[in-house]
Amino acid sequence: EVEKTACPSGKKAREIDESLIFYKKWELEACVDAALLATQMDRVNAIPFTYEQLDVLKHKLDELYPQGYPESVIQHLGYLFLKMSPEDIRKWNVTSLETLKALLEVNKGHEMSPQVATLIDRFVKGRGQLDKDTLDTLTAFYPGYLCSLSPEELSSVPPSSIWAVRPQDLDTCDPRQLDVLYPKARLAFQNMNGSEYFVKIQSFLGGAPTEDLKALSQQNVSMDLATFMKLRTDAVLPLTVAEVQKLLGPHVEGLKAEERHRPVRDWILRQRQDDLDTLGLGLQG
């Protein structure tokens, strides 16, 4: 902490400007009014303050707002956001998507920090659900965001938000997460026709039950092997050789290359050899 010392004559800050970069830490503490700083936060980012000077400015804001900063200040924190701890952020009440975007911009290009994770958590909890605009914003900054949520957190995603999800947003999701997302996607895309529906639902099929896969096998969808490999083992096991052949269409030949990998291996093992032989791929059950 900076000692309380009187501001030297003529050094009292009238506004936040570049002259402050020449102030020592104790001078910033003594000569910059916290209320002035709060109203002119938008200027701070245009001034090349040192990390030590930013520490002083943060300290002044902390003293002014011990219960947490107001959103008018939060929105203009800029690089000062990087000085905040998760504990600081837990005191905030962020409701504006613009505020969220402004702070995510500061951290852009870096992995999700504990500060950002706390900020997002506060924002989403404040909204009560992960709406489409929020999801759009978060996945734009962090493509893996959706898969970082627990199944419990994902349950708050309304089906309408699923339209914002891109295939790459689901790349790192595990089966438990897809179990939650798949029914929402099914609901969201239910009014689409066959081929359009398959294009949209494809990324979510890692959460599909056997009966849905059987239904898809009747629709000439020609599922690729990459999608088939992401299906739930328990959903794949009951499929017959004929159903898998229909589901994959021309891609069925790809089973040979994946015969040592799950879930293909599990499925092969549980088929009758006579049935496997009809595929002509040399698969051994």
Epitope: R176, H261, L269
Partner: antibody
Framework: QVQLQESGPGLVKPSETLSLTCTVS??????????WSWIRQPPGKGLEWIGY???????NYNPSLKSRVTISVDTSKNQFSLKLSSVTAADTAVYYC???????????WGQGTMVTVSS | DIQMTQSPSSLSASVGDRVTITCRAS??????VNWYQQKPGKAPKLLIY???SLQSGVPSRFSGSGSGTDFTLTISSLQPEDFATYYC?????????FGGGTKVEIK
């Protein structure tokens, strides 16, 4: 509640064949979901998977042991067995049988049996 | 074969500590990675399957995460009964492999 119990000689001479049997109780070796594995652990070392068998008789072995290993199943006795030929001192280990549910992992294990290879 | 490299090989921790063990696969294992706990003289016990699913009867302080090549087992608050050796195992490829183990000791 499925339980597994290994049985077989605790001492085997070098170059001979190690033979162990795992008896399944409280469940069936013919279960649709389950694979039956042998896993070993040399003293003070880590775990090494030997191979598995499905009730249909389909097997899959660790490539490093494949030339010496045979796993078989006897559905009438509710047992599966391991044979490891041409043993050396390096095969001295605790041998475990384990059930693998296709949806989870090795969720049920035998208590293990120590096999020493020595003349 | 897919090699599973566990780190650290051993660690010392106190009751109440948060402990993290990592496992790296030499090639993608998707999410087909399991975690086991083994105490001296006992058979291993399944803790986590499919990278992040908690096995029935296992305390919720154990959690797993990861996919592809990097996996983590976390014990949120170490209890006296948790001092043991932990192994990861991949079952994606037909030739199953275990990590070398991580021994968690009392500090």
């Amino acid at each position: 509640q499925v339980q597994l119990q290994e049985s077989g000689p605790g001492l085997v001479k070098p170059s001979e064949t190690l033979s162990l049997t795992c008896t399944v109780s409280g469940g069936s070796v013919s279960s649709y979901h389950d694979l039956w594995s042998w896993i070993r652990q040399p003293p003070g070392k880590g775990l090494e998977w030997i191979g598995y068998i499905y009730y249909s008789g389909s097997t899959n072995y660790n490539p490093s042991l494949k030339s010496r290993v045979t796993i078989s199943v006897d559905t009438s006795k509710n047992q599966f067995s391991l044979k490891l030929s041409s043993v050396t001192a390096a095969d001295t280990a605790v041998y475990y049988c384990a059930r693998e549910d296709a949806l989870t992992g090795f969720d049920i294990w035998g208590q293990g049996t120590m096999v020493t290879v020595s003349s | 074969d897919i090699q599973m490299t566990q780190s650290p090989s051993s660690l010392s921790a106190s009751v109440g500590d948060r402990v993290t063990i990592t496992c790296r696969a030499s090639q993608s294992s998707r999410y087909y990675v399991n975690w086991y706990q083994q105490k001296p003289g006992k058979a291993p016990k399944l803790l986590i399957y499919a990278a992040s699913s908690l096995q029935s009867g296992v305390p919720s302080r154990f959690s797993g995460s990861g996919s592809g090549t990097d996996f983590t087992l976390t014990i949120s608050s170490l209890q006296p009964e948790d001092f043991a050796t932990y192994y990861c195992q991949q079952s994606y490829d037909a030739s199953y492999t275990f990590g070398g183990g991580t021994k968690v000791e009392i500090k």
